[in-house]
């Protein structure tokens, strides 16, 4: 004997968040009177997704016309759909019954799976700033994605990195996904200028993967290297002595010149000339009036790089010596004058 | 009010496909939530329901023609259309092109068209 | 699928005769009956649906009644424009079927 048959053709629907869910379904008969319900999920724990006989769903709507006597299409369409959504789909056919319809025949039900894009990675580096030759890592993250399987990538400067670890969590089924991993990247001085780069690609994206960036310049600090000259000028009682601060980063730094021993003049850096590297040069000087002393100076530059504990270099300046025969004559690469007279 | 036409060639040779298509006038195939439907009469036997689309594209075929039937809707051109692969000379018959209307008896059909299958 | 059984397949009867065609279900398919008119060469039109009711335009000596398994068609005084073939078709189980038809003719 024929009976009526609930037919969900689709065992499986795969629909991209925001976009609308077609869940098919057919009874093959008109007979038992009564109707259809959408739930998702079975057992009693269920939940109601569409009552063709009453209720209010905002997000459904109905394929055919449902109030049609002959209606056997009971598809559904299911808007804007999120990865909250993701489950399996029953229709449900009642019998009409007093006081309450009775579940007569139900299908075999659709799986609805969300496609949902990651968000975009969000790369960070550490809290601390550190020096060439150290290892630092850098985190990235993103959220919120569906299907699970997704794959990251680390580049540095358009170099694909190997040292780093990736998690996927939840490790079992869930609505979405988020993916953290932390790669370890040894700084070079010439960093300034570089990035590493988060490399997230995913089926939603189709092949067009979704990218964050991390400048090492807000990571890495490159100390100071320091050179004191002597040089003569036109009077012959007068020395110029020039600190030469070179090849550093961040440009936060403050020069103290020392006579011995004792502070002279504290100076900020200010014009500042930029490597190519991204690194800063910087030149302080001091004009030194050689007869203004009996005993030999020892003029110390001491510099405090970026809140870290001060470098310095010294200088013996022999007031017993002419000063044109004292010092070497190295070119300043920077002009920038700083000057003070000692009398 | 509503008509019906059904086209295609009135000679197709065995293991080829028929194909068919019925063009629906004096007003919208997508309107009034109607289903459209097939139906074929052999030669002196009486009628055989081939399956039906709704304009939304939800289809159902007689399962004895299944494996073989796709019924297809333009909303665009207000057609729809029949498609019967691997044929034999079994399928040579008058096939008509009906509107299953409110009222659940097709109400509408077209005319009919003579489709014999022979080499 | 379910059978139409129609009888008689064949009836000759005289104009202003009551003619009554039957059609019988393999199972409960409640009224969801309809009865086509098919003259030669032509193709079928409507006359009753859900059993009982006239389809628009039909002229009022076709009646359809029954429910559940046994349906019957009448045609209370046949006029010489009746002379068709008359099919029954349920639409209570998919596929619909049709009844083998019944070929009115006049004596």
């Known amino acids: 004997e024929e009976e009526l048959q609930v037919i969900q053709p689709d065992k499986s629907v795969l629909v991209a968040a925001g976009e609308t869910a077609t869940l098919r379904c057919t009874a093959t008969s008109l007979i038992p009177v009564g109707p259809i319900q959408w739930f998702r999920g079975a057992g009693p724990g269920r939940e109601l997704i569409y009552n063709q006989k009453e209720g209010h769903f905002p997000r459904v709507t109905t394929v055919s016309e449902s109030t049609k006597r002959k209606n056997m299409d009971f598809s559904i369409r299911i808007g804007n759909i999120t990865p909250a959504d993701a489950g399996t789909y029953y229709c449900v056919k009642f019998r009409k019954g007093s006081p309450d319809d009775v579940e007569f025949k139900s299908g075999a039900g659709t799986e609805l799976s969300v496609r949902a894009k990651p968000s975009a990675p969000v790369v960070s580096g550490p809290a601390a700033r550190a020096t060439p030759q150290h290892t630092v890592s850098f985190t990235c993250e993103s959220h919120g994605f569906s299907p699970r399987d997704i794959t990251l990538k680390w580049f540095k400067n358009g170099n694909e990195l190997s040292d780093f670890q990736t998690n996927v969590d939840p490790v079992g089924e869930s609505v979405s996904y988020s993916i953290h991993s932390t790669a370890k990247v040894v700084l070079t001085r010439e960093d300034v200028h570089s990035q590493v780069i988060c490399e997230v690609a995913h089926v939603t994206l189709q092949g067009d993967p979704l990218r964050g960036t991390a400048n090492l310049s807000e990571t890495i600090r490159v100390p100071p290297t320091l050179e004191v000259t002597q040089q003569p000028v036109r009077a012959e009682n007068q020395v110029n002595v020039t600190c030469q601060v070179r090849k550093f980063y961040p440009q936060r730094l403050q020069l103290t010149w020392l006579e011995n021993g004792n502070v002279s003049r504290t100076e900020t850096a200010s014009t500042v000339t930029e490597n190519k590297d991204g690194t800063y040069n910087w030149m302080s000087w001091l004009l030194v009036n050689v007869s203004a002393h009996r005993d030999d100076v020892k003029l110390t530059c001491q510099v405090e790089h970026d809140g870290q504990p001060a470098v310095s270099k010294s200088h013996d300046l022999k007031v017993s010596a002419h000063p044109k025969e004292q010092g070497s004559n190295t070119a300043a690469e920077n002009t920038g004058s700083n000057e003070r007279n000692i009398y | 009010q509503v008509q019906l036409q059904e086209s295609g060639p009135g000679l197709v040779k065995p293991s080829q496909t028929l194909s068919l298509t019925c063009t629906v006038s004096?007003?919208?195939?997508?309107?009034?939530?109607?289903?459209w439907a097939w139906i074929r009469q052999h030669p002196g036997k009486g009628l055989e329901w081939i399956g039906y689309?709704?304009?939304?594209?939800?289809?159902y075929y007689n399962p004895s023609l299944k494996s073989r039937v796709t019924i297809s809707v333009d909303t665009s051109k207000n057609q729809f259309s029949l498609k019967l692969s691997s044929v034999t000379a079994a399928d040579t018959a008058v096939y008509y092109c009906?509107?299953?209307?409110?009222?659940?008896?097709?109400?509408?059909w077209g005319q009919g068209t003579t489709v014999t299958v022979s080499s | 699928d379910i059978q139409m059984t129609q009888s008689p397949s064949s009836l000759s009867a005289s104009v202003g005769d009551r003619v009554t065609i039957t059609c019988q279900a393999s199972?409960?398919?409640?009224?969801?009956l309809n009865w086509y008119q098919q003259k030669p060469g032509k193709a079928p039109k409507l006359l009753i649906y859900d059993a009982s009711n006239l389809a628009t335009g039909v002229p009022s000596r076709f009646s359809g009644s029954g429910s559940g398994t046994d349906f019957t068609f009448t045609i209370s005084s046949l006029q010489p424009e009746d002379i068709a073939t008359y099919y029954c078709q349920q639409f209570a189980y998919l596929p619909w079927t049709f009844g083998g038809g019944t070929k009115v003719e006049i004596k």
């Open positions: 199972q409960d398919i409640s009224n969801y």
């Open positions: 004096g007003g919208s195939i997508s309107s009034g939530g109607d289903y």
């Open positions: 689309i709704y304009p939304s594209g939800f289809t």
């Open positions: 009906a509107r299953e209307g409110y009222h659940s008896g097709m109400d509408v």
